[in-house]
């Protein structure tokens, strides 16, 4: 059946947040379809997203098997309507992705402030532990389960009446901070992996939560 008039994929890009991992590429297909293969450096190729007209392929199920491995993917181009035939010996055009190491490269998702509680001049702020699609036995693991002490959170907090921000850090999911009595404060958190040296070291900031709204609780 040949592979005339098929164009090799290009701009192969990994998009990954909290280990949810999608490979994207170009071009939008005209009279062609794609199949993706993924492998570890020492493993066999596994095919995914067979003969798809999409320009993305969700590879999460493969990479969560071992997020500390380094993966390579490749995208094959076939003529539209292509059916695998045992007689075909011609290799379709393909393009390799950059290498991808999930543990080092997945982006940290936007965190969420789960709750805050004021007792006198102290406020306890708790960050929600996000679930990932990484499994241990048959249970899904949280971001903390995967990264452990590699993951810290930075809290930004300020009086509702002013713009001067203070910061606090924790390697747990809780902060205990001192506040002025009678003042309302606003909070935002950011997830950080200090050991990373790249742009994906930090998450985006969480939505801002302010005292006097429903997430908070105040006790004298």
């Amino acid at each position: 059946s040949g592979t005339t008039n098929t164009v090799a994929a290009y701009n192969l890009t990994w998009k990954s947040t909290n280990f949810k991992t999608i490979l994207e590429w170009e071009p939008k297909p005209i009279n062609q379809v794609y199949t993706v293969q993924i492998s570890t450096k020492s493993g066999d190729w596994k095919s995914k997203c067979f003969y798809t007209a999409d320009t993305e392929c969700d590879l999460t199920d493969e990479i969560v098997k071992d997020v500390k491995q380094t993966y390579l993917a490749r995208v094959f181009s076939y003529p539209a309507g292509h059916v695998e035939s045992t007689g075909s010996t011609e290799e379709p055009p393909y393009e390799n992705s950059p290498e991808f190491t999930p543990y080092l490269e997945t982006n940290l998702g936007q965190p969420t402030i789960q709750s805050f509680e004021q007792v006198g001049t102290k406020v306890n702020v708790t960050v929600q532990d996000e679930w990932t699609l990484v499994r241990r036995n048959d249970t899904f693991l949280s971001l903390r389960d995967v990264f452990g002490k590699d993951l810290i959170y930075t809290l930004y907090y300020w009086k509702s009446s002013s713009s001067g921000k203070k910061t606090a850090k924790t390697n747990t999911n809780e902060f205990l901070i001192d506040v002025d009595k009678g003042e309302n404060y606003c909070f935002s958190v950011q997830a950080v992996i200090p050991s990373r040296r790249t742009a994906n070291r930090k998450s985006t900031d969480s939505p801002v939560e302010c005292m006097g709204h429903e997430k908070g609780e105040s006790r004298e």
Epitope: T101, D129, R144, G148, S195
Partner: antibody
Framework: EVQLVQSGAEVKKPGESLRISCKGS????????IEWVRQMPGKGLEWMGD????????NYSPSFQGHVTISADKSISTAYLQWSSLKASDTAMYYC?????????????WGQGTLVTVSS | DIVMTQSPLSLPVTPGEPASISCKSS????????????LTWYLQKPGQSPQLLIY???TRESGVPDRFSGSGSGTDFTLKISRVEAEDVGVYYC?????????FGQGTKLEIK
């Protein structure tokens, strides 16, 4: 099979420099912390520090900060522990270990140890 | 720094009998995010490198016999051996794997009576 192979025993004089090594194999070297642990003769285990080879990020115990340097060469899957000026009190067995797969899941694999003797 | 304190420091045991080692930390090792205790147990047999027995306070490392079990939460932890065998002799260490600097207990030497 995961293996950590350490360099051989060393006998040095006080004031000399030294670098010992730990070569990892059988796993993706860049994504696991390499830990260094000291055991002085007849004593317990002391954590010295660690390195994540993928980024070169290090952590040190305050007891060892400034006296030793931890580094790694990911191209040859090897981590190093070095001293610029040894003291007699550095005489000990030094172990490298690899972190577990999950977060904070201990030191899952250990090297055989490198015995360092510092004596005038 | 978190201080880890083990007791007893020496533990003579008759083969087939149970053994128990206590480990106390000066701060809680419980992670609020996932409710895991980051306490690890190791065994160093005579003349050997240490080996991992238990992580997350109660999760046995692959290949570790089920006569070893870990329990506890917060600051108080216990390693139990249901029936001691001759091959269990050595020094047992608990470790704070929760926060830097990582710290070990002083060790408990288990010997056969």
């Amino acid at each position: 099979e995961v293996q950590l192979v350490q360099s051989g025993a060393e006998v040095k004089k006080p004031g000399e420099s030294l670098r010992i090594s730990c070569k990892g194999s059988g796993y993706t070297f860049i994504t696991y912390w390499i830990e260094w642990v000291r055991q002085m003769p007849g004593k317990g285990l002391e954590w010295m520090g660690d390195i994540l080879p993928g980024s070169g990020s290090t952590n040190y115990s305050p007891s060892f900060q400034g006296h030793v340097t931890i580094s790694a060469d990911k191209s040859i899957s090897t981590a190093y522990l070095q001293w610029s000026s040894l003291k007699a009190s550095d005489t000990a067995m030094y172990y490298c270990a690899r972190s577990g797969y999950y977060g904070n899941s201990g030191f899952a694999y250990w090297g055989q140890g490198t015995l360092v003797t510092v004596s005038s | 720094d978190i201080v880890m304190t083990q007791s007893p420091l020496s533990l003579p045991v008759t083969p087939g009998e149970p053994a128990s080692i206590s480990c106390k930390s000066s701060q809680s090792l419980l992670s609020s995010g996932n409710q895991k205790n980051y306490l690890t147990w190791y065994l160093q047999k005579p003349g050997q490198s240490p080996q991992l027995l238990i992580y997350w306070a109660s999760t046995r490392e692959s290949g570790v016999p089920d006569r070893f079990s870990g329990s506890g939460s917060g600051t108080d932890f216990t390693l139990k051996i249901s029936r001691v065998e001759a091959e269990d002799v050595g020094v047992y260490y608990c470790q704070n794997d929760y926060t830097y600097p990582l710290t070990f207990g002083q060790g408990t030497k288990l010997e056969i009576k």
